[in-house]
Interface confidence: medium
């Protein structure tokens, strides 16, 4: 039979490659079937028999068409300060991300080892750079004519209201106070919120806090021995 209608296993024509979802087995010197996602090669092909595939066992997966002898292990179960954004199935690995308002402060290829709360900028300081999945919030002192009266990981410095008649001038942490006549603003009223970081499984880049940032009071775990949930196992 010509190669384009051949059934696996078959010997490819010289100089040609195997078809989609097939691989060339060096031992058999034949084009053989790959196993579908969620499966692995239980028995490799020979000159007379095709690949025998089997389903991945619990807590293992294959995401691609493959001919691996065993499925990949899903990553460690998520720690107490993470949320599982993708479950471990036969076709996909588990993905853990830091819970909202937290970021990954220490990671390895296996994923995030340590989540920490996003820094909150204190009154008089606003968010200069928002937190991401892998970097902390950077705060900056509010410039003249702007203020922030909140302790927040999302609020930026806002312009002082502009008064026809000024009662109390604003400073870095309080808005101006007007008398009698209606106030006007150079921006819409209300706090300006920056979006929360989008969950992406990116590698860790270490944040470099600037001298003007508010001190971090973040911590990961309670002081004292780790409860079993924090580690991947109990002792």
């Amino acid at each position: 039979l010509p190669a384009q209608v051949a059934f696996t296993p078959y010997a490819p024509e010289p100089g040609s490659t195997c078809r989609l979802r097939e691989y060339y087995d060096q031992t058999a010197q034949m084009c053989c079937s790959k196993c579908s996602p969620g499966q692995h090669a239980k028995v490799f092909c020979t000159k007379t028999s095709d690949t025998v595939c089997d389903s991945c066992e619990d807590s293992t997966y294959t995401q691609l068409w493959n001919w691996v002898p065993e499925c990949l292990s899903c990553g460690s179960r998520c720690s107490s300060d993470q949320v599982e954004t993708q479950a471990c199935t036969r076709e996909q690995n588990r993905i853990c991300t830091c819970r909202p308002g937290w970021y990954c402060a220490l990671s390895k290829q296996e994923g995030c080892r340590l989540c920490a709360p996003l820094r909150k900028c204190r009154p008089g300081f606003g968010v200069a750079r928002p937190g991401t999945e892998t970097s902390d919030v950077v705060c900056k002192a509010c410039a003249p004519g702007t203020f922030s009266d909140t302790t927040s990981s999302t609020d930026v410095c806002r312009p002082h209201r502009i008064c026809s008649i000024l009662a109390i001038p604003g400073n870095a942490s309080t808005d101006a106070v007007c008398t009698s006549t209606s106030p006007t603003r150079s921006m819409a009223p209300g706090a300006v919120h920056l979006p929360q970081p989008v969950s992406t499984r990116s590698q860790h880049t270490q944040p470099t806090p600037e001298p003007s940032t508010a001190p971090s009071t973040s911590f990961l775990l309670p002081m004292g021995p780790s409860p079993p949930a924090e580690g991947s196992t109990g002792d």
Partner: antibody, heavy 120, light 111 residues
Amino acid sequence: QVQLQQSGAELARPGTSVKLSCKASGYTFTDDYIDWVKQRTGQGLEWIGEIYPGSGNTYYNEKFKGKATLTADKSSSTAYMQLSSLTSEDSAVYFCARSQVYGKIAMDHWGQGTSVTVSS
Amino acid sequence: DIVLTQSPASLAVSLGQRATISCRASESVDNSGNSFMHWYQQIPGQPPKLLIYRASNLESGIPARFSGSGARTDFTLTIDPVGAVDVATYYCQQSKEDPYTFGGGTKLEIE
């Protein structure tokens, strides 16, 4: 309870290789790192590297790249370290230790150690 | 690589007294309010044993006479009161970044 059982003492000739084993029990082997640490007689501790058995990913101290090769067998919950091209400088006790992916991020359980003596 | 310098190299303390061991890192081992510094005890002929993790957290099963403190580059292990069973060599170790490194060790003796 978590236990790490290491293989017995090795006497080897210069230029040869040895393969040390570390069998884990009492926890899910694929969930945590296995670290390897060297200690020469009367000396301090030196980190060789670590392996994440779940994926086989390895991390090495540059000093031990080419000297140590870390592997793991999930089916037997055993981690291995092969030391190649042995010299007298490799004579030491080698420890394996578990390091949790989350939480402590420290080596909280250790094997008893394997003594390697390189001598002609 | 982060270099850890322990002092003193050896220490003799009377039973019931306080022992203080210092560990200084060549650069900060802190990240986001966590210090990735740990302390181990090694009795001759035995493997090291984790005493304190992340600077100040007492490992399960370790007596409360052991405590750790410090941040960034300067860390301290305190044993108070010292007992006869505490004769050992003590090591600090950082896990902030690869390669993980250990201090040179402090040998504690009873005088």
